[in-house]
């Protein structure tokens, strides 16, 4: 007789990523018998959660059910009904958060309190929701694209099944640019970790890694804004700045309250003579990268080496992999490509920056003019980030891989934050075992 | 059910102002950027302005700066506009409506839901 | 600003019958990403507007399949087949390519 496949004995996750500026829900999915296999976990589904981040939603708590609803409405119908109840959820939220609580924790604790009330309502295995440290986000996201590149396999193999695979184990870096925060993680070549905080110690499929990790609270690309246009009006003549990182011809009304709402901002606080200032772009990429550099604070160093603000950094080694904001910036401004070099990249900046307002409009009529106006100074400042901020150069900008999805997983910190919490990367390799033919009879 | 409710009427002086309000309900109130549009009597439509109800973010037609003003309520759900210096050209009804942008946020949308619109008479 | 010309009156038309609104932009709204920026609402007697159709050629949620639309660039034409005694009010078409958008006159669709 034929064989039957039988029902596929499959597992699910969903793990919510609560971000300053919006909220995503992953479904994962792996064959049950192969958990401690590497690279068997893949993602299902992503639905962005409509709206805000929750850390927006402080004077609207009671919203926060409806607001989720749509995404875990969605879970349902992709999981299997018989699966739900042991299917985990988990939600991490990241520096958006963060925030929030440095500002109130009572209000943060609020938040939070309704998001896991709200999402206990569904009928599946609900496993809490916690702000993560800057120091977690980095690692996940460092095991995330890693497992996806099969760089914790310990079999070696002639072919390629992933993008940027060097057919080594040497891991890649990962560098994560969110809303309020940025992280940079990677394996230093034999240089010892000189500030203990920087430093992670994992043991994965009998592999020891010492990692390096740091995430940059207010250095996100939304928080950096904000703090640099607090920091230019401190010394504006008047209620008008004449701003390089929004291009020539735009215009847009600010609030002094709204630029201070900020913990970012309060380095550089001060009383104003007016209530509003109006931005008027002159779209100059030099001047715009030099603005953004005074956010670096590389002036003191207590270690061998700095990326900025006093903070360790060791010499970048390996490849990179740059997801998140910095894939989304760069994916817009057509600029992911391998083949670019960093003096190409600055140079179409320079122009895209130079463009008038009406032109770039028209260019991009689709898209709603708040988000639009933002691409000249998220690039400049992702070049300004990689570049002084990280100390990559022209010849080392070709090891960064500007990365979407990986064998169609997004790249990020919360397939690593599931592995972990799910346990299914061992510290030890696993023994192998003859294939399976438990699925058919 | 999603609802936008706004007052019916409103009677108002010339030269005087005016605040009209739209109170959103069935929906998570931050998610959706809320337009308001004018209609005069036996007339089309014009369109005065956006708000994004999660940050203030405000677009204007040129013609009304200085006339209409957006802002909102986030703790009541409520959106409003301001109407300042009226005059008989201010007579109409206006309508504030929620926009629809599908799964990609940064697009720009479609007015899905529509308030029940408040009559404003500019009249001594 | 984007001018959107309508005429004001369609012919009286009768039940179950074909009926064409038309619309013109005074610039192209379809873009260069392929996506044509047009809008048609109906405003019932009494009532406030609701969307028909979104981006040329998609039904909103609730909407009969009796209404399409199609067009280039600049010249639209809103279709609506078996006209129903309820299709009656004012078809509006508008564009969201540029800021400000702006909408038509209006067309009245009325039965014989």
């Known amino acids: 007789t034929q064989n039957k496949a039988l029902p596929e004995n499959v597992k699910y996750g969903i793990v919510l990523d609560a971000g300053s500026s919006h909220t995503s829900l992953y479904i994962y999915k792996w064959p049950a018998e192969k958990e401690n296999d590497t690279g068997v976990v893949h993602q299902v589904e992503e639905c962005r959660v409509k709206g805000p981040g929750i850390s927006k939603f402080v004077q609207k708590v009671n919203e926060i059910g409806i607001y989720l609803t749509d995404c875990m409405e969605r879970a349902r119908e992709v999981i299997p009904r018989s699966q739900h109840q042991e299917t985990p959820v988990y939600l991490g939220a990241t520096a958006g958060m963060r925030l929030l609580r440095m500002e109130s924790e009572e209000l943060a604790d609020r938040v939070l309190d309704v998001v896991e009330r709200s999402l206990s309502n569904y009928p599946f295995d609900f496993q809490g929701a916690r702000i993560i440290t800057g120091q977690e986000e980095g690692a996940y996201g460092w095991i995330t694209i890693n497992y996806l590149l099969g760089k914790f396999s310990q079999k070696t193999r002639w072919f390629s099944i992933v993008p940027y695979e060097t057919n080594n184990q040497e891991t890649f870096g990962a560098l994560d640019l969110g809303g309020a925060s940025t992280q940079v993680t990677f394996v230093p070549q034999n240089q010892t970790i000189e500030s203990p905080d920087n430093a992670l110690q994992f043991r994965l499929y009998g592999k020891d890694y010492n990692v390096y990790t740091h995430s940059f609270l207010c250095y996100g690309k939304d928080q950096a804004l904000w703090q640099k246009l607090a920091k230019d009006i401190q010394v504006a003549s008047n209620e008008i700045l004449r701003d390089p990182c929004f291009h020539p011809g735009y215009k847009k009304v600010v609030n002094v309250s709204d630029l201070y709402k900020t913990p970012c901002t309060k380095r550089f606080e001060m009383t104003l003579p007016f209530q509003q200032f109006e931005i008027q772009g002159i779209g100059n990429y030099q001047q715009c990268h030099q603005s953004i550099l005074e956010l670096f604070n590389t002036s003191y160093c207590p270690y061998s080496q700095c990326a900025f603000n006093g903070i360790f950094l060791p010499p970048l080694q390996g490849d990179f992999g740059a997801f998140s904001a910095f894939y989304f910036v760069m994916k817009f401004l057509n600029l992911t490509s391998e083949k670019v070099s960093q003096e190409k990249v600055t140079e179409m900046m320079k122009k895209f920056c130079a463009q008038p307002w009406e032109e770039i409009k028209t260019s991009y009529a689709g898209v709603k003019e708040k988000y639009l106006s933002e691409y000249c100074f998220s690039g400049t400042y992702i070049l300004s980030l990689l570049l002084q901020g990280y100390h990559f150069t022209a010849d080392s900008w070709e090891h960064i891989h500007f990365i979407g999805k990986i064998q169609g997983s997004d790249a990020g910190w919360t397939l690593g934050y599931m592995l972990n919490l799910t346990n299914m990367i061992p510290a030890e390799q696993p023994l192998s075992t003859p294939l399976s033919h438990s699925t058919y009879v | 059910q999603v609802q936008l409710q706004q007052p019916g009427t409103e009677l108002v002086m010339p030269g005087a102002s005016v605040t009209l309000s739209c109170k959103a309900s069935g929906y998570s109130f931050i998610s959706y950027w809320m337009h308001w549009v004018k209609q005069r009597p036996g007339q089309g439509l014009e369109w005065i302005g956006e708000i994004d109800p999660s940050d203030d973010y405000t677009n204007y037609n040129q013609n009304f700066k200085g006339k209409a003003t957006l802002t909102v309520d986030r703790s009541s759900s409520t959106a409003y506009m301001q109407l300042n210096s009226l005059t008989s050209e201010d007579s109409a009804v206006y309508y504030c409506?929620?926009?629809?942008?599908?799964?990609?946020?940064?697009?720009?949308?479609?007015?899905?839901?529509w308030g029940t619109g408040t009559t404003v008479t500019v009249s001594s | 600003d984007i001018v959107m010309t309508q005429t004001a009156f369609s012919n009286p038309v009768t039940l179950g019958t074909s009926a064409s609104i038309s619309c013109r932009s005074s610039k192209s709204l379809l873009h260069s990403n392929g996506i044509t920026y047009l809008y048609w609402y109906l405003q019932k007697p009494g009532q406030s507007p609701q969307v028909l159709i979104y981006q040329m050629s998609n039904l909103a949620s609730g909407v009969p399949d009796r209404f399409s639309c199609s067009g280039s660039g600049t010249d639209f034409t809103l279709r609506i087949t078996r006209v129903e005694a309820e299709d009656v009010g004012f078809y509006y078409c508008?564009?969201?390519?540029?800021?400000?958008?702006?909408f038509g006159g209006g067309t009245k669709l009325e039965m014989k």
């Open positions: 409506a929620r926009e629809e942008n599908g799964i990609y946020y940064y697009n720009k949308g479609y007015l899905d839901v």
């Open positions: 508008a564009q969201n390519l540029e800021l400000p958008y702006t």
